[in-house]
């Protein structure tokens, strides 16, 4: 019998016939050891690996570049996947990018993008993004035209600020940019007028922080 | 590079008009608020005039209301202050400035143009 | 509108010593956001104003890191660690919390 192949990310997974959103292990190209991701498999008919979840404040989301290159968190909560891992899934076929977002009076929307890709770590894991479409706002929370990727510890944005200090997180800030999903974690009634939120400008305005987002990408041919 | 190259300025007689431009480059202007900025001889610096990145919201500073107009053209990169009934308090040079940060999120001037000189003169 | 007071407003250094510029409002500049919308510029002479620091305390991206901003509410100050001879002209400090944003008078500083 031909030994399976393992899975590259959560559509093989569900190609695989694993229907259920979970945990699964993913062996990425050219990555050394196997990775833990979370795959969404009800949302838009599943076969999402999610590179970022937030939900409850309970992670820190202020670390410098070394942790956002490796990630940090858990899987089964909020989590960064990583910008090596991004990347690196990224680099094995075309993908798609869907971000579900829900502000703290219930209300869902989402953004998606036909293609995504960010460069690599020399590259400052520069956002690449075509075809936005979604309810998350008409014009796109991310930088269309490419945005490097900064922390407090790596200043590659667009302004004569340090944004990711400034607005806290890491993120494909400009100057700063519409969006920051990696902001501080901000309650109920204390969620306005916070620069350094959670933000998706579009949807929610410049000072408002979400209650949750997900970050999630899969193959352009699934 | 930023750029913000300003023209316009001259002499002018009281009660008369004048036009000042500025013309951005080297970023997305429509992604940023700009302002009016002026300076008497040999004084400090006044607040003018500020318009949104969308050019929805407008701020005057009392001293010009009403005789000064601010407005923006997106598509050609250019910021105008359209100045009606000029009055000899108002000879100064005058800066358009940048937002610092975009998206209407205001933290002070990021950028200044080379500054143009106005003078009321009879 | 709120009054923005500097002090000194003369200020003579020799080169490699400090100096600091004292600057009061009359209104508390803490933003409901959590910041203080308190910039500082300085004007060379026959030049246009440059921003040196940014919501109080946060310098501004190629300024020196002779010049720190400090300060919280109504009264703020900008340091400099060692004058140099390029760092003439006339600092203004400027508050944007709340509307009309206003500038303090200036504070000439020049080379003793």
């Known amino acids: 019998r031909e030994e399976e192949k393992p899975f590259r990310d959560c559509a093989d997974v569900y190609q695989a016939g694993f229907n259920k959103s979970g945990i699964y292990t993913i062996y990425i190209n050219n990555m050394p050891e196997p990775k833990k991701v979370f795959c969404n498999m009800d949302v838009n008919g599943g076969g999402w690996t999610v590179i970022q979840h937030r939900e409850d404040g309970s992670l820190d989301f202020q670390r410098g570049w070394k942790e956002y290159k490796m990630g940090f968190g858990n899987p089964s909560g909020e989590y960064w996947l990583g910008n090596e891992f991004i990347f690196a899934i990224t680099s094995q076929r075309q993908y798609m990018l869907r971000i579900e977002l829900m502000d703290w009076e219930g209300n869902r929307a989402y953004s998606q993008y036909d293609r995504f890709h960010i460069g690599n770590e020399k590259q400052n894991y520069r956002l690449y993004l075509k075809g936005h479409t979604g309810t998350a706002g008409k014009q796109s929370s991310l930088i269309l035209h490419g945005a490097d990727f900064s922390t407090k510890d790596a200043d590659n944005d667009n302004c004569m600020c340090k944004c990711a200090l400034m607005l806290t997180g890491g993120w494909w800030f400009d100057a700063c940019g519409p969006s920051n999903l990696n902001g501080m974690f901000y309650t109920a009634g204390q969620n306005h007028g916070k620069l350094n939120g959670i933000k998706w400008h579009y949807f929610k305005g410049p000072s408002y922080s979400l209650r949750s987002t997900t970050m999630m990408i899969r193959p352009l041919d699934f | 590079e930023v750029q913000l190259v300003q023209s316009g300025g001259g002499v002018v007689q009281p009660g008369r008009s004048l036009r000042l431009s500025c013309a951005a480059s080297g970023f997305t202007f429509s992604s940023y608020g700009m302002h009016w900025v002026r300076q008497a001889p040999g004084k400090g610096l006044e607040w003018v005039s500020y318009?949104?990145?969308?050019?929805?919201?407008?701020y005057y500073a009392d001293s010009v209301k009403g005789r000064f107009t601010i407005s923006r053209d997106n598509a050609k990169n250019s910021l105008y202050l359209q100045m009606n009934s000029l009055r000899a308090e108002d000879t100064a040079v005058y800066y358009c400035?940048?937002?610092?940060?975009?998206?209407?999120?205001?933290?002070?001037?990021?950028?200044w143009g080379q500054g143009t000189l106005v003078t009321v003169s009879s | 509108d709120i009054v923005m007071t500097q002090s000194p407003l003369s200020l003579p250094v020799t080169p490699g010593e400090p100096a600091s510029i004292s600057c009061r409002s009359s209104q508390s500049l803490l933003h409901s956001v959590g910041y203080n919308y308190l910039d500082w510029y300085l004007q060379k002479p026959g030049q246009s104003p440059q921003l040196l620091i940014y919501l109080g305390s946060n310098r501004a991206s190629g300024v020196p890191d002779r010049f720190s901003g400090s300060g919280s509410g109504t009264d703020f100050t900008l340091k400099i660690s060692r004058v140099e001879a390029e760092d003439v002209g006339v600092y203004y400090c400027?508050?944007?919390?709340?509307?009309?944003?206003?500038f303090g008078q200036g504070t000439k500083l020049e080379i003793k």
């Open positions: 400035a940048r937002d610092l940060l975009d998206y209407d999120i205001w933290t002070g001037y990021g950028y």
């Open positions: 400027m508050q944007g919390t709340h509307w009309p944003p206003t």
């Open positions: 318009i949104s990145s969308s050019g929805s919201t407008i």
